[in-house]
Interface confidence: low
């Protein structure tokens, strides 16, 4: 019963001219040990002779091995389990079917294995994940349907022709289930890798190029933006105009929406790549950026700090502290919104200018009763002088003086 023979090996093996082929193979002949083994190339059954015709690459009988002209073919098996074969070197005309003619005392079997030998080293195959996103680690896999103990090879990864510095893990399989060499590379692509060429290069033991496979990276990323402003220093005076332009340097997939933000809040009805601010007011000072979104998410430009300069506003005075007790100290603070900040201050006491007082703060170390009254100030910057505000009242408390009896 020929069904007693059970074989396991790869269905097809791949190699190229001058390399070698290692054929992992196991078998079971349940009725006894192997008595004779012949390895045929492209065997054909001859009905007249009831035998197989074809090139005999290897013969081994119970009387011993028949000397083979082809020392390159080796049967590495045994009489009851192992049918592993090696052909080194392997040639183009070895392509086709290998026939393992096995005979025990009572049974015969012809097992066929396909051998595919190419003229030149065939390329490996790069496998990429279905989607690659910026900054997310992915594993790139390079698979070659070849491995042979007598012919060491290596797989090297290149990005735009430059070796990738990340450590790749190479594994080989020479089992009855599969024969392959695989290299896996963990890689965190940046948006700038989009469109770049990754190559897996097959090299011999000396690093000589044999073949390669290339893929173009499709790195999904949020839009990358540049913001330009006129004037370039983003410093203007009230009433001037400002133009900001948003440029998309890269987006994958294509962008879908555009918006502008001021101090983190979206500006209504501003959905084009140019933001025109006419006759700006001081309220329009702040941090501006553009935001462009695609299916991956929103991308934001760097922030531009728009400074709208204006003359000081009417000043107010803050007194620390009123009422004040005679002999205590008091500090006056002149407060006025201005851009740039005021550089000079004028102080007034009861409407009369206080000489020599030009700072934001006035400090009186020892209050006397006559210091009581209204204090006001005027702030000044390069754009002009502000108005005097309403002022603040200093109340000075003191004990009775010059007591007279009535």
């Amino acid at each position: 019963d020929s069904s007693k023979w059970v074989f396991e090996h790869p269905e097809t093996l791949y190699a190229w001219e001058g390399a070698c082929v290692w054929i992992p193979c196991t078998y079971r002949a349940l009725d006894g040990d192997l008595e004779s083994f012949i390895l045929f190339h492209n065997p054909e059954y001859n009905k007249n002779t009831s035998k197989f015709d074809g090139t005999r690459l290897y013969e081994s009988t119970k009387d011993g091995k028949v000397p083979s002209e082809q020392k390159r073919v080796q049967f590495l098996g045994d009489k009851n389990k192992n049918c592993t074969l090696s052909i080194h070197p392997v040639h183009l005309n070895d392509s086709g079917q290998l026939g393992l003619r096995m005979e025990s005392k009572t049974e015969k079997w012809m097992e066929r294995i396909h051998l595919n030998v190419s003229e030149r080293p065939f390329p490996p195959h790069i496998q990429l994940p279905p989607e690659i996103q910026e900054s997310q680690e992915v594993t790139l896999t390079c698979l070659l349907n070849f491995s042979c103990y007598g012919y060491p090879i290596q797989l090297q990864w290149l990005l735009e022709g430059v070796p990738m510095r990340q450590a790749a893990v190479t594994s080989t399989s020479l089992t009855i289930k599969s024969v392959f060499t695989r290299s896996e590379l963990k890689f965190s692509p940046q948006w700038s890798h989009h469109g770049k060429i990754v190559t897996c290069q097959l090299q011999d033991a000396d690093g000589k190029f044999l073949s390669n496979d290339t893929v173009q990276l499709n790195v999904k990323h949020t839009p990358k933006l540049e913001i330009k402003v006129t004037p370039s220093d983003a410093i203007v005076r009230e009433g001037d105009s400002v133009t900001m332009t948003c440029e998309v340097s890269s987006s994958n997939p294509e962008y879908t929406t555009v918006s502008w933000l001021k101090d983190g809040t979206s500006l209504k009805k501003q959905n084009t790549f140019t933001l025109n601010l006419r006759e700006v007011t001081k309220d329009q000072s702040g941090k501006y950026c553009c935001q462009v979104s695609n299916d991956v998410g929103p991308g934001r430009s760097e922030e531009v700090f728009l400074q709208v300069q204006y003359a000081p506003e009417p000043s107010t005075v803050q007194i620390l502290h009123s009422p004040a007790v005679e002999g205590s100290q008091v500090e006056f603070l002149c407060m006025s919104l201005a851009n740039p900040l005021p550089t000079n201050y004028t102080w007034y006491h009861n409407g009369k200018e206080m000489q020599g007082r030009t700072e934001e703060k006035v400090h009186i170390p020892k209050i006397l009763p006559w210091h009581a009254g209204t204090y006001s100030c005027v702030a000044e910057n390069i754009l002009g002088t502000g108005q005097r505000g309403p002022g603040a009242e200093l109340d000075v408390q003191y004990p009775p003086k010059k007591v007279t009896t009535v």
């Epitope: 269905e11 097809t12 024969v179």
Partner: antibody
Framework: EIQLQQSGPELVKPGTSVKVSCKAS????????MYWVKQSHGKSLEWIGY????????RYNQKFKGKATLTVDKSSSTAYMHLNSLTSEDSAVYYC??????????????WGQGTSVTVSS | DIVMSQSPSSLAVSVGEKVTMSCKSS????????????LAWYQQKPGQSPKKLIY???TRESGVPDRLTGSGSGTDFTLTISSVTAEDLAVYYC?????????FGGGTKLEIK
């Protein structure tokens, strides 16, 4: 005849764990990889991972790493899948699948009858 | 992971009618080295385990009637039943075995009118 006999249905409490078994017969246990597949009620199939009984090598779907642990007992030709920290999301029918594949990836496959796991308090 | 999308999700046909169902993958399942498409079709009858019908996108498993035909390449695949019988009542799943993790489509439920 190749057969895969799976353990019976399980009703377990949230937070606990369960071990599903799959006993193989009719073939050399070490020559077929054992795959596991999840099918939630009325839903599609999800590939959990496989174990090679010959050497114990495993490969998991990233989604099930830490959730499922695959082991084998060669002496009894049995494969096991241990599921931990169970939640209602783990309620499903779990299938074992014995696969023999060649180097190109084609697979001869045989399926178990499925094991129903219900997670409920 | 490779995403598999099937359509329609369900369909009802009369016995003897021809039916086609579609399966699309998020990346090509055609392996350039051997020109094979790493796609299989499974049939799951009510209360049963899935059963493989077709592999390499178009090769029938032994014992599968030739009424069932798989076709397509790359990312678009089709399963056709030329003349539906009551036996065909089932959910049909496509599955890619191009790269790990292997993934299945959502299924197409075939009902008989």
């Amino acid at each position: 005849e190749i057969q895969l006999q799976q353990s019976g249905p399980e009703l377990v409490k949230p937070g606990t764990s369960v071990k599903v078994s799959c006993k193989a017969s009719g073939y050399d246990f070490t020559r077929y990889n054992m795959y596991w597949v999840k099918q939630s009620h009325g839903k599609s199939l999800e590939w959990i991972g496989y174990i090679d009984p010959y050497n114990g090598d495993t490969r998991y779907n990233q989604k099930f790493k830490g959730k499922a642990t695959l082991t084998v007992d060669k002496s009894s030709s049995t494969a096991y899948m241990h599921l931990n920290s169970l939640t209602s999301e783990d309620s499903a029918v779990y299938y074992c699948e014995a696969i023999y594949y060649d180097m190109e990836g084609y697979a001869l496959d045989y399926w178990g009858q499925g094991t129903s796991v219900t997670v409920s308090s | 992971d490779i995403v598999m999308s099937q359509s329609p999700s369900s369909l009802a046909v009369s016995v003897g009618e021809k039916v086609t169902m579609s399966c699309k993958s998020s990346q090509s399942l055609l392996y350039s080295n051997n020109q094979k498409n790493y796609l299989a079709w499974y049939q799951q009858k009510p209360g049963q385990s899935p059963k493989k019908l077709i592999y390499w996108a178009s090769t029938r498993e032994s014992g599968v009637p030739d009424r069932l035909t798989g076709s397509g390449s790359g990312t678009d695949f089709t399963l056709t039943i030329s003349s539906v019988t009551a036996e065909d009542l089932a959910v049909y799943y496509c599955q890619q075995f191009y790269s790990y993790p292997w993934t299945f489509g959502g299924g197409t439920k075939l009902e008989i009118k």
